[in-house]
């Protein structure tokens, strides 16, 4: 978290916001519900308190407006700048102002207002933007689902450097980015795209260049807003320019930015039985069009040619692949090798001698 | 629906740079990914480079760190700026708006000699 420079705050803490104006976008019963919701992410968490007032000067004054609009920083037109505010102090200090030149939303379409007035909210109160592409402090917008909203660890460190924790936190669960270097990091899935890594933990991913060290995290929705938050297995079908993502009992086909039409689709559609409620990683081999699935402690070998399961699978896993352990978190192939991932340990098994060649740290694949 | 023109192809040195644009009719060009193919004689067309809604980007490995792609949504055009020219680089270039099973526009060629 960042903020402001001198560490501007407010000296009180029952502060008050007035709504100036609406967008034509959204009802003002929507407007309104927004803004209570957005002001309630930080007063869950500190000893703040909002009152909405009516009319006359409230500290935090809320409008809509476009292009220039009255403080000389001016909005774009669609896109862009979506929304700005001031850091708490006297007169334009802590307003927050809505561009609408956007559509504003109570939805993922358009701009979601609670989302976008819950990061200006942000502002109004002292802090500055985050680097941790977890926060909502963070400087892109990405909608992050129709669930409960839950404010990032990150923000709640922010804010209460600032005015200190509340009396009680409805809700006390807050999101962590995860450490790349964790020696306990385990992983969700892994595939290559497009010659990159990506490399999947709870809403997030990895995105691992070639003769690259640093690798950059990304919200998984700030790719691909429609997929779920959370990816069980993903693989990538180079000559196709596809990549697969797997969540629960369904699955997408994404070219590049784009999921393909028709889908989701039920992974019962490639031949598994009703029991299998969720994968738990997934390998594609080009020269072969296999793609090796995993689920539980079994692996399943699904024929590109055929469209359908190999006979003789699903099979155990420890038989298919002794010393792997009866699990796989994630799994790809580079070169010749399969790297099995169990928890925090990788294991690489070379396909030509059909067996396991190293044991490495799961974290070594971020370079740790 | 959109239609998809490329311009500013044409023919350069090995180390030369190029500039495309990919202009967009319809007024929903900025709410598709916009996306850079390229297909050279007796092979397949393959990715070149990427650029989401949001504006995060894409390159494939033999391309990145000399083009850049960019978008401007208000005058609904893309852009792919090619520097450090290589003769493998020559191909046709297409503009693609929303993926494989988008919009495409026809092509402009581009001609890299040593």
């Known amino acids: 978290y960042n903020v402001f420079p001198r560490t501007l705050k407010w000296s009180q803490t029952n502060l008050t916001y007035r709504i100036v104006n609406y967008t034509p976008d959204i009802s003002h019963s929507e407007v309104e519900k927004a803004f209570r919701k957005a002001f309630k992410v930080w007063s869950d968490v500190t000893p703040l308190n909002f009152t909405r007032i009516h009319d006359g000067t409230a500290d935090i004054m809320i409008s809509f407006g476009t292009k220039e609009h009255g403080d000389f920083y001016p909005f774009d037109g669609p896109s862009g700048l979506l929304a700005h505010a001031f850091p708490p102090g006297p007169n334009l200090g802590g307003d927050a102002h809505f561009d609408d030149d956007e559509t504003w939303t109570s939805s993922s379409k358009g701009y979601n207002l609670f989302i976008v007035a819950a990061h200006e909210l942000g502002h109004s109160l002292g802090l500055d933007h985050s680097k941790d592409p977890g926060a909502l402090m963070f400087p892109i917008y990405t909608y992050t689902g129709k669930s409960h909203f839950m404010l990032p660890d990150d923000d709640v460190q922010g804010i209460q450097s600032l005015y200190g924790p509340g009396d009680e936190d409805p809700n006390p669960k807050h999101p962590k980015t995860p450490e790349k270097c964790d020696p306990a990091l385990s992983l969700d899935a892994i595939t290559s795209l497009r010659g990159e890594t990506m490399i999947f933990k709870d809403r997030f991913f990895w995105r691992l260049h070639p003769q690259q060290v640093e690798p950059e995290l990304f919200l998984t929705k700030s790719f691909w807003p429609e997929l779920p938050n959370h990816v069980d297995a993903a693989y990538e079908h180079p000559s196709r320019d596809l990549m697969f993502i797997f969540r629960g009992r369904k699955f997408w086909a994404l070219n590049g930015y784009d999921i393909m039409e028709g889908y989701p689709r039920k992974i019962s559609d490639l031949g598994f039985p009703k029991e299998v409620k969720r994968l738990s990683a997934a390998v594609h081999f080009e020269d072969t069009g296999k793609t090796l699935f995993f689920s539980g402690n079994h692996v399943w070998s699904y024929d590109d040619a055929n469209q359908t399961m190999d006979k003789d699978y699903p099979r155990l896993i420890e038989e298919e692949f002794p010393g792997i352990g009866d699990k796989v978190d994630a799994v790809y192939e580079k070169n010749g090798y399969i790297y099995f991932f169990n928890g925090p340990i990788q294991f690489e098994y070379s396909i030509w001698s059909n067996r396991i060649v190293r044991v490495m740290p799961t974290n070594s694949l971020l370079w740790c | 629906e959109v239609q998809l023109v490329e311009s500013g192809g044409g023919s350069v040195q090995a180390g030369g740079s190029l500039r495309l644009s990919c202009a967009a009719s319809?007024?929903?060009?900025?709410?598709?990914?916009m996306n850079w193919y390229r297909q050279a004689p007796g092979k397949q067309r393959e990715f070149v480079a990427g650029?989401?809604?949001?504006?995060?980007?894409n390159y494939a490995v033999s391309v990145r760190g000399r083009f850049t792609i960019s978008r401007d949504n208000a005058e609904g055009t893309g852009y792919l700026q090619m520097n450090s020219l290589k003769p493998e680089d020559t191909a046709v270039y297409y503009c693609?708006?929303?993926?494989?099973?988008?919009?495409w526009g026809l092509g402009t060629q581009v001609t890299v000699s040593s």
């Open positions: 319809g007024s929903t060009f900025s709410r598709y990914s």
């Open positions: 693609n708006a929303g993926g494989l099973q988008g919009y």
């Open positions: 650029i989401s809604v949001g504006r995060i980007t």
